[in-house]
């Protein structure tokens, strides 16, 4: 047992049929010593007598808000949560498995550029009782610090039968060094309680590989005299690292046809423009990528061609 | 080329080899199945690399007041990439296969240390640490594990020639 | 007590389908992870399959991926296991275990034979 | 994947004497998550030890588990009748989870 904040205490329980539990001993925060007694929940009914209450957790019934009283009067609270244990495997049943990159894939963070500014995100498809608190560190044995804000609703989804929905949180870490190698990745940690089950989950990464730049702005196209050629221009996104000389971007430049089926004609660039010839009913589109780091790719920016 | 007084290296050479290296390196060793090599244990490995850390200078300011510092910082860096490049890490079991794209890194880090430092002049370089895996099934992993850190050490040696040979050539 | 009871085996051609259920009692089923675990005859023991309490996660031997895939259905105390495009190497004895990772209980084992 | 090698292939011991049997990991096995289980002929597979050397519920205190990485040991410290059997070890630290081809404990 261990303590997740004032008066809330984490039970981590091996979790198979018939298991012998955990036994619990937990203290009333009093000075009284003398007419205590103990209720669990809403419950009236009567656990136990004494500065100290004696449980033998198994269950999810076992869990819950124990409360000693003394004369009417409520001494203190302690609410017990329950951590899952299957074979040695922490129970993953709040959140989705968005199996990208890899199976096991709870939370996906991504970055714009090298601030260390991040963004982190999780799927549940439970819509009430639910809870997220988040930590992140650099580095473990000797964390650097990392601020979070608060995880926030940032989408909501109909999947088949059941609503899909999408928690977010920000992150910077709060000394970073956006032209360093980084030598520790980054940690974050997710605490999710939904009604009286805990868990945790976290992802360990490091921002150069977490990078994906905004789609290049301003795409523009300019039609080259007495041919069937543009000249297409684009600029950084302004969210990447400046100066741009040191943190460089490539670029892929793409003429796609009206249908999905024609042939797709690439041109990849380091430079702002390219000259590529333009189909009647195409479309051209470019994306962004750190020009010496095989990150992801940016979203496409797209114009058509006519 | 860095010569004991502490002029400028051919920058765009260097820009162009040092690029040249990027791609290498990812052609050695695309993401393979994501394997994540954080879980597998890596602490006694790839500690030891050498890392272009905050204060070596190789920030575009850094390299303003005295791009010396970072050069030799990615010279040692080099050097014991190269090293590793040509250990039995590399050279044992499993054979790498003959068009593998390591021999090319392995000549490429050598290039453009030389490029960084001529004949005569010595910095000081860091010891390589004694990493011997018994089982080829460790030496692969040793090797995703080193040619991923090359892969990081590479991209910011990339952005420190590409922005010296945009501002500080001649 | 815990029990657990398969049922569902018998003989079938290659590239034919079957559907193994266990009953499960004794225990709060729609708390815990199940598995089937296969033994072909006189051989050893394969980890076929497991889901999770809510049926949310599931695994698969590589040797069965796209062909079987593992269900439950909490309100009736049963797991399931649809076997499809089924091999002669399936033939096995098919057992219905608790847990995730460790099978700590196990049900008698059905016989599922693919032959022509 | 991980692959499992039990050794011997058959033990011939008498009742009373001290039974080890070897389980080796092709590669190392994450936080020692092996299983030890126990198989009579007919019979279901039943759980003797897990997380390498914590005993199941009901298993007598005369088996034993011990190891760690790749190379792992179920000892039955004096050998019951009903010890005689096909004992199989099952790694779980990595997926697929994976068993060796079992070792046969029988009557000298």
């Known amino acids: 047992i261990w303590e997740l904040k004032k008066d809330v205490y984490v039970v981590e329980l091996d979790w198979y049929p018939d298991a012998p539990g955990e036994m619990v001993v937990l203290t009333c925060d009093t000075p009284e010593e003398d007419g205590i007694t103990w209720t669990l929940d809403q419950s009236s009914e009567v656990l136990g007598s004494g500065k100290t209450l004696t449980i033998q957790v198994k269950e999810f019934g076992d869990a819950g808000q124990y409360t000693c009283h003394k004369g009417g009067e409520v001494l203190s609270h302690s609410l017990l949560l329950l951590h899952k244990k299957e074979d040695g495997i922490w129970s993953t049943d709040i959140l989705k498995d968005q199996k990208e990159p890899k199976n096991k894939t709870f939370l996906r963070c991504e970055a714009k550029n090298y601030s260390g500014r991040f963004t982190c995100w999780w799927l549940t498809t439970i819509s009430t009782d639910l809870t997220f608190s988040v930590k992140s560190s650099r580095g473990s044995s000797d964390p650097q610090g990392v601020t979070c804000g608060a995880a926030t609703l940032s989408a909501e989804r109909v999947r088949g039968d059941n609503k899909e929905y999408e928690y977010s949180v920000e992150c910077q870490e709060d000394s970073a060094c956006p032209a360093a190698e980084e030598s520790l990745p980054i940690e974050v940690m997710v605490d999710a309680v939904h009604k009286l089950k805990y868990e945790n989950y976290t992802s360990s990464f490091f921002i150069r590989d977490i990078i994906k730049p905004d789609p290049p702005k301003n795409l523009q196209l300019k039609p080259l005299k007495n041919s069937r050629q543009v000249e297409v221009s684009w600029e950084y996104p302004d969210t990447w690292s400046t100066p741009h000389s040191y943190f460089s971007l490539t670029f892929c430049v793409q003429v796609q046809g009206k249908s999905k089926r024609e042939k797709k004609d690439r041109v990849f660039t380091d430079k702002t423009s390219a000259t590529v010839i333009c189909r009647k009913n195409a479309s051209i589109s470019v994306r962004a990528q750190d020009r010496y780091y095989s990150s992801s790719w940016s979203e496409w920016a797209s114009v058509p061609c006519s | 080329r860095a010569v004991p007084g502490g002029s400028s290296p051919a920058w765009t050479q260097c820009q162009q080899l040092s690029q040249k290296l990027c791609t290498l390196a990812w052609s050695a060793h695309p993401l393979v199945g994501h394997m994540d090599l954080r879980e597998e244990g890596d602490e006694e490995t790839t500690n030891d690399v050498p890392h272009i850390q905050c204060g070596d200078g190789c920030d575009p300011q850094g390299l303003r007041d005295n791009s010396q510092f970072c050069l030799q910082r990615i010279h040692q860096g080099l050097i014991f990439y190269e090293k590793l490049l040509g250990s039995d890490i590399f050279t044992g079991e499993p054979s790498l296969l003959p068009d593998s794209p390591v021999g090319q890194l392995h000549a490429s880090l050598l290039g453009l240390s030389q490029l960084l430092q001529p004949e005569g002049h010595h910095w000081e370089t860091q010891q390589i640490p004694s990493l011997s895996p018994s089982q080829p099934w460790q030496r692969l992993l040793l090797r995703f594990k080193i040619l991923r850190s090359l892969q990081a050490f590479v991209a910011v040696a990339a952005r420190v020639f590409a922005h010296g040979a945009a501002t500080l050539s001649p | 007590e815990v029990q657990l009871l398969e049922s569902g085996g018998g003989l079938v051609q290659p590239g034919g389908s079957l559907r193994l259920s266990c009953a499960a009692s004794?225990?709060?089923?729609?708390?815990?992870?199940m598995g089937w675990v296969r033994q072909a005859p006189g051989k050893g023991l394969e980890w076929v399959s497991y889901?999770?309490?809510?049926?949310?996660?599931?695994g698969y031997a590589d040797s069965v991926k796209g062909r079987f895939t593992i269900s439950r259905d909490n309100s009736k105390n049963t797991l399931y296991l649809q076997m499809n495009s089924l091999r002669a190497e399936d033939t096995a004895v098919y057992y219905c275990?608790?847990?995730?990772?460790?099978?700590?209980?196990w049900g008698q084992g059905t016989l599922v034979t693919v032959s022509s | 994947d991980i692959q499992m090698t039990q050794s011997p292939g058959t033990l011939s011991l008498s009742p009373g004497e001290r039974a080890t049997l070897s389980c080796r990991a092709s590669q190392s096995v994450s936080s020692s998550y092996l299983a030890w289980y126990q198989q009579k002929p007919g019979q279901a597979p039943r759980l003797l030890i897990y997380?390498?050397?914590s005993r199941a519920t009901g298993i007598p205190d005369r088996f034993s588990g011990s190891g760690s990485g790749t190379d792992f040991t179920l000892t039955i410290s004096r050998l019951e009748p009903e010890d005689f059997a096909v004992y199989y070890c099952q790694q779980y630290g990595s997926s697929p989870w994976t068993f060796g081809q079992g070792t046969k404990v029988e009557i000298k």
């Open positions: 889901i999770s309490s809510s049926g949310g996660v599931t």
């Open positions: 004794g225990f709060t089923f729609s708390r815990y992870s």
């Open positions: 997380g390498a050397s």
């Open positions: 275990a608790t847990g995730i990772a460790v099978a700590r209980y």
